[in-house]
């Protein structure tokens, strides 16, 4: 049974980049408003984001607890100025989104190259280690934490005079590279999870970083 | 609770296949790494291999690739580990593991171990 | 491949005294993103499988006791056990969990004096 001029949300969609996890759905609401629940497949549904006339609800509280669960969430309708009654037996529309399991599923966020060291014919290049919203006795971990040995990247490097592109990769956060004497090099990395087998298995690539600004230095 | 039960103790011949099972319980069987460890007759472990059941993504020691094969089955929660053609070095105690909630947090539940004996 | 010595191969202990076991590896096992030094140290007590004592080298385990601990960075650790007891008996490993492949040390015997 239904509500009263009320109609079931659809297109629920998941959202989620380096753990930070939003569920989205349609439609624009005319004169309703929208509560979103959340569960993982043995556990109890949790209701956020109350009577919301937006089309998302920020997740990432609940997700970060476990982002090695499988979650599924559902929208529910009510009519506009709907206010919660013990004597209501009626149940609102709703729908289900697709399962979620973080772990595998969230995006990897666009890297950004730390910093590089120039010293002779070699070139330290080091990612930065991106913070997330996952905890551990409340201390927030990085996305290295997380994935580990599960997370590694790409180093795309080229002089700064041709478009020839080169790659190394590595499994921690830093390359070691020969450049040629004499010759300025730009970097762009990018991250990846080579265990998956989806769209989401790397990153954006990061701003390209050049040797000769501000980030880098120069030793003989 | 989490539980990781091995499949029973096998007896074989050599040039014989053979396909032991680890099956996983009280937990996301998708999102964890399922490894696989030999232990020879009084000896110490060696970590054969991983795979992740969520993508069938598998990590293989080179001292093993070719002669084992690691696969996992996500719909019953199992992962098995196949030899083709059993040799009498492979005589052994084979553990599955999983691998812990962080990354890199080492192999936090065990199986209880398969014993194999491959005599002719 | 990253190469895991242990030492020594035998430890015989009294009970109520520490003990200690180095390990070290041929290779920095440093992450450089997150500064965790990745590094486990289990126990196989006789007859059975292995259990997890410590990870991130000093990270102990969910219901390991507080007289293990483990110490060191880059390619030298310990785990350090300060007042042996009966049950500590069996065979002490430590593994790189860094790099792939995984490997283990060839293993430390405690045994009761």
């Known amino acids: 049974s239904g509500t009263t001029n009320t109609v079931a949300a659809y297109n629920l969609t998941w959202k989620s980049t380096n753990f930070k996890t939003i569920l989205e759905w349609e439609p624009k609401p005319i004169n309703q408003v929208y509560t979103v629940q959340i569960s993982t497949k043995s556990g109890d549904w949790k209701s956020k984001c109350f009577y919301t006339a937006d089309t998302e609800c920020d997740l990432t509280d609940e997700i970060v607890k476990d982002v090695k669960q499988t979650y599924l969430a559902r929208v529910f309708s009510y009519p506009a100025g709907h206010v919660e009654s013990t004597g209501s037996t009626e149940e609102p529309p709703y729908e289900n989104s697709p399962e979620f399991t973080p772990y595998l599923e969230t995006n990897l966020g666009q890297p950004t190259i730390q910093s590089f060291e120039q010293v002779g014919t070699k070139v330290n290049v080091t990612v930065q280690d991106e913070w997330t919203l996952v905890r551990r006795n409340d201390t927030f971990l990085s996305l290295r934490d997380v994935f580990g040995k599960d997370l590694i990247y790409t180093l795309y490097y080229w002089k700064s005079s041709s478009s020839g592109k080169k790659t190394a990769k590595t499994n921690t956060n830093e390359f070691l590279i020969d450049v040629d004497k004499g010759e300025n090099y730009c970097f762009s990395v990018q991250a990846v999870i080579p265990s998956r087998r989806t769209a989401n298995r790397k990153s954006t690539d990061s701003p390209v970083e050049c040797m000769g600004h501000e980030k880098g230095e120069s030793r003989e | 609770e989490v539980q990781l039960v091995q499949s029973g103790a096998e007896v074989k011949k050599p040039g014989e296949s053979l396909r032991i099972s680890c099956k996983g319980s009280g937990y996301t069987f998708i999102t964890y790494w399922i490894e696989w460890v030999r232990q020879m007759p009084g000896k110490g472990l060696e970590w054969m291999g991983d795979i992740l059941p969520g993508s069938g993504s598998t990590n293989y020691n080179e001292n093993f690739k070719g002669h084992v094969t690691i696969s996992a089955d996500k719909s019953i929660s199992t992962a098995y580990l196949q030899w083709s053609s059993l040799k009498a070095s492979d005589t052994a105690m084979y553990y599955c593991?999983?691998?812990?909630?962080?990354?890199?947090?080492?192999?936090?539940?065990w199986g209880q171990g398969t014993l194999v004996t491959v005599s002719s | 491949d990253i190469v895991m010595t242990q030492t020594p191969l035998s430890l015989p202990v009294t009970p109520g005294e520490p003990a200690s076991i180095s390990c070290k590896s041929s290779q920095s096992l440093l992450s450089s993103g997150n500064q965790k030094n990745y590094l486990t140290w289990y126990l196989q007590k006789p007859g059975q499988s292995p259990q997890l004592l410590i990870y991130?080298?000093?990270t102990r385990e969910s219901g390991v006791p507080d007289r293990f601990s483990g110490s060191g960075s880059g390619t030298d650790f310990t785990l350090k056990i300060s007042r042996v007891e009966a049950e500590d008996v069996g065979v002490y490993y430590c593994?790189?969990?860094?790099?792939?492949?995984?490997?283990f040390g060839q293993g430390t015997k405690l045994e009761i004096k």
């Open positions: 593991a999983r691998s812990g909630y962080y990354g890199n947090s080492g192999f936090a539940y």
């Open positions: 991130w080298a000093s």
């Open positions: 593994q790189n969990d860094y790099t792939y492949p995984l490997t």
